[in-house]
C-alpha cells in the first residue's frame, strides 16, 4: 500500500489550496482594515478571551472529538485544523461583504473573528459525517460552500425575521447536522470487504476523542453566550448551559450503562451525549429563568442522545454510509430540533403572556426560520455532495477510506499500521 498521495492529488491540492489562499490574501488587502477605535486594552483582552475559548473548542474540542477511528485519527485532527483556518478567513470576508460592504471597506473586529470562528465550527460539525471518505481538496470545497450557505442563511434570517446574532447563529446545530448528513448521502456508501476494521474505534484514539469531548464540555458555556448583548444575558447563558451539560454528563454515563445488556458504558455514546445539554439549551440558554429547567433539559437531551446513539447508527450506516462512531450529525440534528422546539414553546408563552392574539403568526415565523435553515442546509449539502463526487478531486478509493496512510508520511511504517 503506497503512503503517497496519488500524483493527481499531489498536483491538485497544493495548487488549489495555495491559489485560494492567495485569492483570500488579495481580498483582505483590497477590502479590509482593522477597527482603529479600540480605546480600552483591558476590554480588548477580555473580549479576546471569548474568541480564544471558541478557537479551543474548534481546534482541540471538535478536532479530537472526531479522532476516534482506529486508522484515521491524524487526519481527523489535522484536517479539522485546516478547515478551521480556511473557514475563519472566508467567514470573516463573507460576513463583512454581506453586512458592512455598502459602507466601504470591511472593518475587522474581535467580534467578527468570533462570528467567523462560530461559522467555521459549523463545518467541523458537518464534516464528522464524511471524514475518512474525502481528501483535503474536497474538504476545501465543503468549507467554501458551507460557510457561504451559513453566512447567507444568517443574513436572510436577520433581515427577514429580525433575529439577533445569538438567535440566528444558534441555527448552526440544525444547519450543520443536516448539511453534513446530506453531503454524506451523496458520497459512495458501502465499505468494501476487508476495510470494515478501519472505521472501528481504538483505545488511544477514543481517549483523544474523549479529551475533545472534555474540551467541548468545558467551553460550551462560552459558545452559547458568545454572541449575547448584555452581561445579564451572558450570565444566564453561562449558568444554564453549565447546568444542562452537567446533567447531560450524568445522564449520558448512566443512560449508556442502562442501554447495554451487561450494563457497560459505551465510549461512543458518552463522547456525544456529554454535549447534549449544551446543544439543546443553546437557543434559549439566556432566557431560561431557573436552573432546574436547564437541568431538566439536560436530562431530556442526554436521554435523547443515548437513545439516538443506540438506535440510529444502523439506519445512518445503511442509508448515509456514516460509521457508527460518527454520530455527531444525527445527534445534533435531534438535539438542535429539541432546542428550537423549546424556543418556540417560550415564544408561545411570551405571546400568551402579553395577551397577544398573534401567537400563530409568531410561531409561524419561528417555524419558518427553522424550516429555512433546514432547507438551505439540505440544498447546499446536496450541492456540495454532488461537487465532491466530481472526478476532478480524485477522491480516495473506497478501499482507502478511513486510512491515515493515504494522506500522511509515516517513516517507520512500510505497510499497514
Amino acid at each position: 500500500m503506497s503512503s503517497k498521495y496519488p500524483r493527481s492529488v499531489r498536483r491538485c491540492l497544493p495548487l488549489w489550496a495555495l491559489t485560494l489562499e492567495a485569492a483570500l490574501i488579495l481580498l483582505f488587502y483590497f477590502f479590509t482594515h482593522y477597527d482603529a477605535s479600540l480605546e480600552d486594552q483591558k476590554g480588548l483582552v477580555a473580549s479576546y478571551q471569548v474568541g480564544q475559548d471558541l478557537t479551543v473548542m474548534a481546534a482541540i474540542g471538535l478536532g479530537f472529538l472526531t479522532s476516534s477511528f482506529r486508522r484515521h485519527s491524524w487526519s481527523s485532527v489535522a484536517f479539522n485544523l485546516f478547515m478551521l483556518a480556511l473557514g475563519v478567513q472566508w467567514a470573516i470576508l463573507l460576513d463583512g461583504f454581506l453586512s458592512q460592504f455598502p459602507s466601504g471597506k470591511v472593518v475587522i473586529t474581535l467580534f467578527s473573528i468570533r462570528l467567523a470562528t462560530m461559522s467555521a465550527l459549523s463545518v467541523l460539525i458537518s464534516v464528522d459525517a464524511v471524514l475518512g471518505k474525502v481528501n483535503l481538496a474536497q474538504l476545501v470545497v465543503m468549507v467554501l460552500v458551507e460557510v457561504t450557505a451559513l453566512g447567507n442563511l444568517r443574513m436572510v434570517i436577520s433581515n427577514i425575521f429580525n433575529t439577533d446574532y445569538h438567535m440566528n447563529m444558534m441555527h448552526i446545530y440544525v444547519f450543520a447536522a443536516y448539511f453534513g448528513l446530506s453531503v454524506a448521502w451523496c458520497l459512495p456508501k458501502p465499505l468494501p470487504e476487508g476495510t470494515e476494521d478501519k472505521d472501528q474505534t481504538a483505545t488511544i484514539p477514543s481517549l483523544s476523542a474523549m479529551l475533545g469531548a472534555l474540551f467541548l464540555w468545558m467551553f460550551w458555556p462560552s459558545f452559547n453566550s458568545a454572541l449575547l448583548r448584555s452581561p445579564i444575558e451572558r450570565k444566564n447563558a453561562v449558568f444554564n448551559t453549565y447546568y444542562a451539560v452537567a446533567v447531560s454528563v450524568v445522564t449520558a454515563i448512566s443512560g449508556s450503562s442502562l442501554a447495554h445488556p451487561q450494563g457497560k458504558i459505551s465510549k461512543t455514546y458518552v463522547h456525544s451525549a456529554v454535549l447534549a445539554g449544551g446543544v439543546a439549551v443553546g437557543t434559549s440558554c439566556h432566557l431560561i429563568p431557573s436552573p432546574w429547567l436547564a437541568m431538566v433539559l439536560g436530562l431530556v437531551a442526554g436521554l435523547i442522545s443515548v437513545g439516538g446513539a443506540k438506535y440510529l447508527p444502523g439506519c445512518c450506516n445503511r442509508v448515509l454510509g456514516i460509521p457508527h462512531s460518527s454520530i455527531m450529525g444525527y445527534n445534533f440534528s435531534l438535539l438542535g430540533l429539541l432546542g428550537e422546539i423549546i424556543y418556540i414553546v417560550l415564544l408561545v408563552l411570551d405571546t400568551v403572556g402579553a395577551g397577544n392574539g398573534m401567537i400563530g403568526f409568531q410561531v409561524l415565523l419561528s417555524i419558518g426560520e427553522l424550516s429555512l435553515a433546514i432547507v438551505i442546509a439540505l440544498m447546499s449539502g446536496l450541492l456540495t455532495g454532488l461537487l465532491l463526487n466530481l472526478k476532478i478531486w480524485k477522491a480516495p478509493h473506497e478501499a482507502k477510506y478511513f486510512d491515515d496512510q493515504v494522506f500522511w508520511k509515516f517513516p517507520h511504517l512500510a505497510v499497514g499500521f
Epitope: 476590554g43 446574532y165 448583548r229 448584555s230 439566556h286 411570551d350 405571546t351 398573534m358 403568526f361
Partner: antibody, heavy 125, light 105 residues
Framework: QVKLLESGGGVVQPGGSLRLSCVAS????????MHWVRQAPGKGLEWVAF????????GYVDSVKGRFTISRDNSKNTLYLQMKSLRAEDTAVYYC??????????????????WGKGTTVTVSS | VMTQSPSSLSASVGDRVTITCRAS??????LNWYQQKPGKAPKLLIY???SLQSGVPSRFSGSGSGTDFTLTISSLQPEDFATYYC?????????FGPGTKVDIK
C-alpha cells in the same frame, strides 16, 4: 448619583471631523451597553449607534455607516463618537444613553434608562 | 417603522390623554415610551410596553402588544406637557416614533 455628561460638540465645516465624549458617573459603565441618539433642530429622536458592554460589537444607523465610529474606554468610564465627513444633516443635539436589559420570555427587551444632557453639533460653512 | 398618532394634541389639566404607537410588523411587547421637555434630555417612562419605570408617577400607563400600543395619562398634570416618543427594541437597531406633542389647550 447616576449621570452621563457629553462633551466635544461645536461648529464644524462640512467634511470636517469631531469627537464626542460621554463620561459616566455613579455606575460602572462596563456593565452596560451604550448608545448615541441625536435630535435635529425641531425634529424627533433618531438612534445613531450602539456599542455592547464589552465593546465587542457595534451598530449604526445606515446614514452614518462608514463615517461615524462608536467606541468606549471602560477603564475611564467613557464613551466616544468619532464623526468624520460631516454633513449639514448631521447638525443635531447628540445624547448618550445607557442601555438596560430586561428578560422577556422569548427575547430580551432593551431600553434607555439614563440619558445625558446632550451636546450640540453644528455643521455649517 | 414606527408611527405615532396623533402628531400633536391639545388637552387641559385633569384630562385623560391617550397616545397610540403602531409598528409596521409585530414587535410583541418590546416597546418603550419616553417623555421629552423642550431643551431637556428624554426621560424613560414605560418599558416593555407596560412596566412603569421607577420614579415615574402612576398616572402614566402603557398597554398593547404585537403592532398596536398605547400610552395613557389618566389625569394630565401641568408638568406632563411635553413630547412623547415610542421606541422599539425588537430589532437590534432601535427606532423611535416621530413623537406626539402634548400642549395646553
Amino acid at each position: 448619583q447616576v449621570k452621563l455628561l457629553e462633551s466635544g460638540g461645536g461648529v464644524v465645516q462640512p467634511g470636517g471631523s469631531l469627537r464626542l465624549s460621554c463620561v459616566a458617573s455613579g455606575f460602572t459603565s462596563r456593565s452596560y451597553g451604550m448608545h448615541w441618539v441625536r435630535q435635529a433642530p425641531g425634529k424627533g429622536l433618531e438612534w445613531v449607534a450602539f456599542i455592547w458592554f464589552d465593546g465587542s460589537n457595534k451598530g449604526y444607523v445606515d446614514s452614518v455607516k462608514g463615517r461615524f465610529t462608536i467606541s468606549r474606554d471602560n477603564s475611564k468610564n467613557t464613551l466616544y463618537l468619532q464623526m468624520k465627513s460631516l454633513r449639514a444633516e448631521d447638525t443635531a443635539v447628540y445624547y448618550c444613553a445607557r442601555e438596560k436589559a430586561l428578560r422577556g420570555i422569548s427575547r430580551y427587551n432593551y431600553y434607555l434608562d439614563v440619558w445625558g444632557k446632550g451636546t450640540t453639533v453644528t455643521v455649517s460653512s | 417603522v414606527m408611527t405615532q398618532s396623533p402628531s400633536s394634541l391639545s388637552a387641559s389639566v385633569g384630562d385623560r390623554v391617550t397616545i397610540t404607537c403602531r409598528a409596521s410588523q409585530s414587535i410583541s411587547s418590546y416597546l418603550n415610551w419616553y417623555q421629552q421637555k423642550p431643551g431637556k434630555a428624554p426621560k424613560l417612562l414605560i418599558y416593555a410596553a407596560s412596566s412603569l419605570q421607577s420614579g415615574v408617577p402612576s398616572r402614566f400607563s402603557g398597554s398593547g402588544s404585537g403592532t398596536d400600543f398605547t400610552l395613557t395619562i389618566s389625569s394630565l398634570q401641568p408638568e406632563d406637557f411635553a413630547t412623547y416618543y415610542c421606541q422599539q427594541s425588537y430589532s437590534t437597531r432601535f427606532t423611535f416614533g416621530p413623537g406626539t406633542k402634548v400642549d395646553i389647550k
